[in-house]
Structures are given as structure tokens and as C-alpha cells.
């Protein structure tokens, strides 16, 4: 049988990108990070 036409099978999962800045104390400046899907990646 021929195949019914479908897409590639790879699904795109939309995730929220959250940029954040956190003050860590008077002399240490700030941490700037990027969180993707709940995981800090930068």
C-alpha cells in the first residue's frame, strides 16, 4: 500500500524563553541569564 501523506514526524515543542537579571550583592554586580523550558542555559 502507498503511504498516506504526513509531515516529517518531527514535532516543534514551543518553549518559553525567559531572560532574567539577578542582583547577587553589593559588589558582585548582576547575573544575566537565559532560561529555556525551565533550564538555565546561559
Amino acid at each position: 500500500d502507498a503511504e498516506f501523506r504526513h509531515d516529517s514526524g518531527y514535532e516543534v515543542h514551543h518553549q518559553k524563553l525567559v531572560f532574567f537579571a539577578e542582583d547577587v550583592g553589593s559588589n558582585k554586580g548582576a547575573i544575566i541569564g537565559l532560561m529555556v523550558g525551565g533550564v538555565v542555559i546561559a
Epitope: D1, A2, E3, F4
Partner: antibody, heavy 122, light 112 residues
């Protein structure tokens, strides 16, 4: 919301051509991956897939009926059509039009029309 | 064509019972893209069929979590954990991987 509605002649004679129309709303047949199938169900029996048309005009047919079927669309009017030539009493059934979009997580026949009943008299 | 065989033909249950319906395909329905397009539909009396489960085990929007699908290759199962009155009707499995898409013969879920 997504709705589909089938219309047809109700009753016709053997050897005539059956023409069915599916009018839909809530989606567009110009959207990538979108498609509409025709499925029929004789009274008290199971479901038989007939044909499918995609957004890009590619069409698929049930091989056992292919020589008698023609599916087409008018995307600007949100309509899909099915023609069945040389009908016989075995073509008496409720005919459904059904949406299926292939470029999506829910790749299945997610919305069905209410069906239109067709009786072929000999 | 891919033959879809459903068992049982009729399934008498008491409300609150678990129900299990089997669907077997005559050949593998794994698509070349890696997905298995096995779906379950419920047709209540006088109504059109409605989608319950797609791609073997995914519940469609609004479908209660008492419905679950499982299986692989050629052997698939629909389970209803606690049958309610609104679940009565005819259940159809369907494969959408090959042309033509084909349906099982149906399983009628009815009150014992």
C-alpha cells in the same frame, strides 16, 4: 469554531452521478497541511474512507473506487466537492466530510460533519 | 488494504467497570516518518464519529483521562478505566498511515 456541513441530493437513481458538497468554517484550505476527507457509512454498517484533498490540490483516492471518484475544492468559498459516477444501491449511505491537518501535533480526523444521507434507488 | 480487526464485536459492561477493546492491523502501520497513525473514534447513536485518541496514545482535547490508548506495530488497545453512561456507543479504530485509511468493524459498548 470548526464546523463542516455536507449537502447532497438525498435520493437519486442507479447509474446517475452523485454530487456532494462540504461547506466548512473555522479553518482555511489554503493553510499548509490542511485537508478534507470524504467518508461514508451504509446504514447500520462500518466506515469507509473514500478520498482526501490537501491544501496544495494533491488528492488521494480509495483504490477500490478510484475510477468513479473525483474530489475537488474551492478554497476561496470554503467548499470541498465529491462526485461519484455510475452509482448503484450499494452507494446508499451517510456521507461525512472530515478535516485532517497533517502539519500539526493532532494529525487525525479531528472534526466531522453531521453527515448527509444518500439513497440510490434502482 | 490494511485490514483492521477489532475485538470484541460487543462489550457489555456495568457502569464503573473497566472496558478494554483490542485492534489488530494486518501489517505494520508505522509510517516512514516514524509515527504510528492509529486513532480511536466513538460514534454515539444518531451522531457522527468523534475523535478520542490519535497517534496510538494521545487524548484529543476535551477527552476525559479515563480513556487511554496503547500498543505498537500491529497490536493496539483502548481502555476505559471507569465506564460512564456517556461512553456508550460504537468504538472504531482507524489506521491513517497507508492508503486507503481503514477502519475496524467497530465495538459496541453497551450496558450489561
Amino acid at each position: 469554531q470548526v464546523t463542516l456541513k455536507e449537502s447532497g441530493p438525498g435520493i437519486l437513481q442507479s447509474s446517475q452521478t452523485l454530487s456532494l458538497t462540504c461547506s466548512f468554517s473555522g479553518f482555511s484550505l489554503t493553510t499548509s497541511g490542511m485537508g478534507v476527507s470524504w467518508i461514508r457509512q451504509p446504514s447500520g454498517k462500518g466506515l469507509e474512507w473514500l478520498a482526501h484533498i490537501y491544501w496544495d490540490d494533491v488528492s488521494l483516492y480509495n483504490p477500490s473506487l478510484k475510477s468513479r471518484l473525483t474530489i475537488s475544492k474551492d478554497a476561496s468559498r470554503n467548499q470541498v466537492f465529491l462526485k461519484i459516477t455510475s452509482v448503484d444501491t450499494a452507494d446508499s449511505a451517510t456521507y461525512y466530510c472530515v478535516r485532517r491537518r497533517i502539519i500539526t501535533v493532532v494529525d487525525a480526523m479531528d472534526y466531522w460533519g453531521q453527515g448527509t444521507s444518500v439513497t440510490v434507488s434502482s | 488494504d490494511v485490514l483492521m480487526t477489532q475485538t470484541p464485536l460487543s462489550l457489555p459492561v456495568s457502569l464503573g467497570d473497566q472496558a478494554s477493546i483490542s485492534c489488530r492491523s494486518s501489517q505494520s502501520i508505522v509510517h516512514s516518518n516514524g509515527n504510528t497513525y492509529l486513532e480511536w473514534y466513538l460514534q454515539k447513536s444518531g451522531q457522527s464519529p468523534k475523535l478520542l485518541i490519535y497517534k496510538v496514545s494521545n487524548r484529543f482535547s476535551g477527552v476525559p483521562d479515563r480513556f487511554s490508548g496503547s500498543g505498537s506495530g500491529t497490536d493496539f488497545t483502548l481502555k476505559i478505566s471507569r465506564v460512564e453512561a456517556e461512553d456508550l456507543g460504537i468504538y472504531y479504530c482507524c489506521q491513517g498511515s497507508r492508503v486507503p485509511p481503514t477502519f475496524g468493524g467497530g465495538t459496541k459498548l453497551e450496558i450489561k
